[in-house]
Interface confidence: low
Amino acid sequence: DPVLCFTQYEESSGKCKGLLGGGVSVEDCCLNTAFAYQKRSGGLCQPCRSPRWSLWSTWAPCSVTCSEGSQLRYRRCVGWNGQCSGKVAPGTLEWQLQACEDQQCCPEMGGWSGWGPWEPCSVTCSKGTRTRRRACNHPAPKCGGHCPGQAQESEACDTQQVCPTHGAWATWGPWTPCSASCHGGPHEPKETRSRKCSAPEPSQKPPGKPCPGLAYEQRRCTGLPPCPVAGGWGPWGPVSPCPVTCGLGQTMEQRTCNHPVPQHGGPFCAGDATRTHICNTAVPCPVDGEWDSWGEWSPCIRRNMKSISCQEIPGQQSRGRTCRGRKFDGHRCAGQQQDIRHCYSIQHCPLKGSWSEWSTWGLCMPPCGPNPTRARQRLCTPLLPKYPPTVSMVEGQGEKNVTFWGRPLPRCEELQGQKLVVEEKRPCLHVPACKDPEEEEL
């Protein structure tokens, strides 16, 4: 099926940028792995590079505004022509759910005290308003609550005194039209406007002040424009050469609004000054190699010795990594393929252990399934041997610093009937539903 092809994929937002055009196949669009595509306008944007997990979304709002609730976040497998870790197809969502608490307590309403006395009238003549107030402290609200209703109320009051009314101008009326719309007529154009002393009129008893200034205003019409000329398009110019050496590109034609040029405020040409076409080099773009993550450290050994495990004898170990994905003369991976270090082997060594403190609570599992729970653990942690800071080696090797390697066998006193791990579980509360955020936007 044809897709919309874009020149950029924005990792931070997951959006396609720089529309190249539509009506091309996914395979043609993804000749350049820096490109991205959409199956329909406004649909999910997928980059052409090999699939990998997006960043986790921000945590959704807590499912309740007070007391303990839960919140979700998600990430999506994005890319083309492959799978994300865990053999997951592009477009698939993965969820995490955790406990949350925006506010420990829930708001409680308060009660009003009695009304206070009325304040004086707001005016000294005619009618005004007066106000009285009450306090929200009977009892006081808790945890951000409030009292229902208003803290003050007002009522009309009459001073039994007549107020004088001073005159004020109403707004100016419109200017009368000028006698011509373009400059160069037989008479000098003039425009006039007027206003009334009616907003309000001054009172007679008690006497109010009249409006200051003039009721009429006249002026010459200046700066009338010459009559406008609308612009017109010239012919389309030549098509530009295809600007890329691999994948799809975009060529362009241009035209100029000069046939004629717009004059004296006449409108500019309607329509576009440029138009574009897709050009296809049919050449795949180079793909640079990328290092896989480091492999596991090899077993800690020492040449000419069968085993050094559980002994104060240092050995060596190495790990490697693979340069993957290099195609079409892309760059090779930079850096070393192998890493070497010195080590003490404590593989399968029985060591005295001690119980750790409780870990922090883990995520709610399953995030989208029924009855998710969270857990925390105490682990039997091995006490590593306290070897001296310098270790005497064979002739010519000197004293070496080493890294402990291997999985020891810690021994702890039994705790709640367990020897290695003690776990505590708790249900997650007020769990929201998992919904695809792309479907929510439609």
Partner: nanobody
């Protein structure tokens, strides 16, 4: 972290002397061992000389009696005095530092300085 900077490399004739110096910065109070390694073209990197925090030294058989390693804790430097140089001493010489405690260790390397012995 510990940063190491070597100096003093250069070109010498057979039988002449050269003094390499390595200055350490960062968390140098945790360094237990300091050493000089070298790597000739097409060969594995090999230990030349090593000195512990308490002054114990170790030398490769090929340099015993000709090279001397010393450490100045006040200036955070380790030096390698190379006398009676031979053509087989031609290599890139690297300064090395080891941090170590009962929970494990870390190893740090300088960028290297070229020593060429001709004749």
């Amino acid at each position: 972290q510990v940063q190491l900077v070597e100096s003093g490399g250069g070109l010498r004739q057979t039988g002449e002397s050269l003094r390499l110096s390595c200055t350490a910065s960062g968390r140098i109070f945790e360094v237990n061992m300091m050493a000089w390694y070298r790597q000739a073209p097409g060969k594995q990197r090999e230990l030349v000389a090593e000195i512990s925090r308490v002054g114990t030294t170790t030398y490769a058989d090929s340099v015993k009696g000709r090279f001397t390693i010393s450490r100045d804790s006040a200036k955070n430097t380790v030096t390698l005095q190379m006398n009676s140089l031979k053509s087989e001493d031609t290599a890139v010489y690297y300064c090395n530092a080891l941090q170590y405690d009962r929970y494990g260790g870390a190893e740090y390397w300088g960028q290297g300085t070229q020593v060429t012995v001709s004749g």
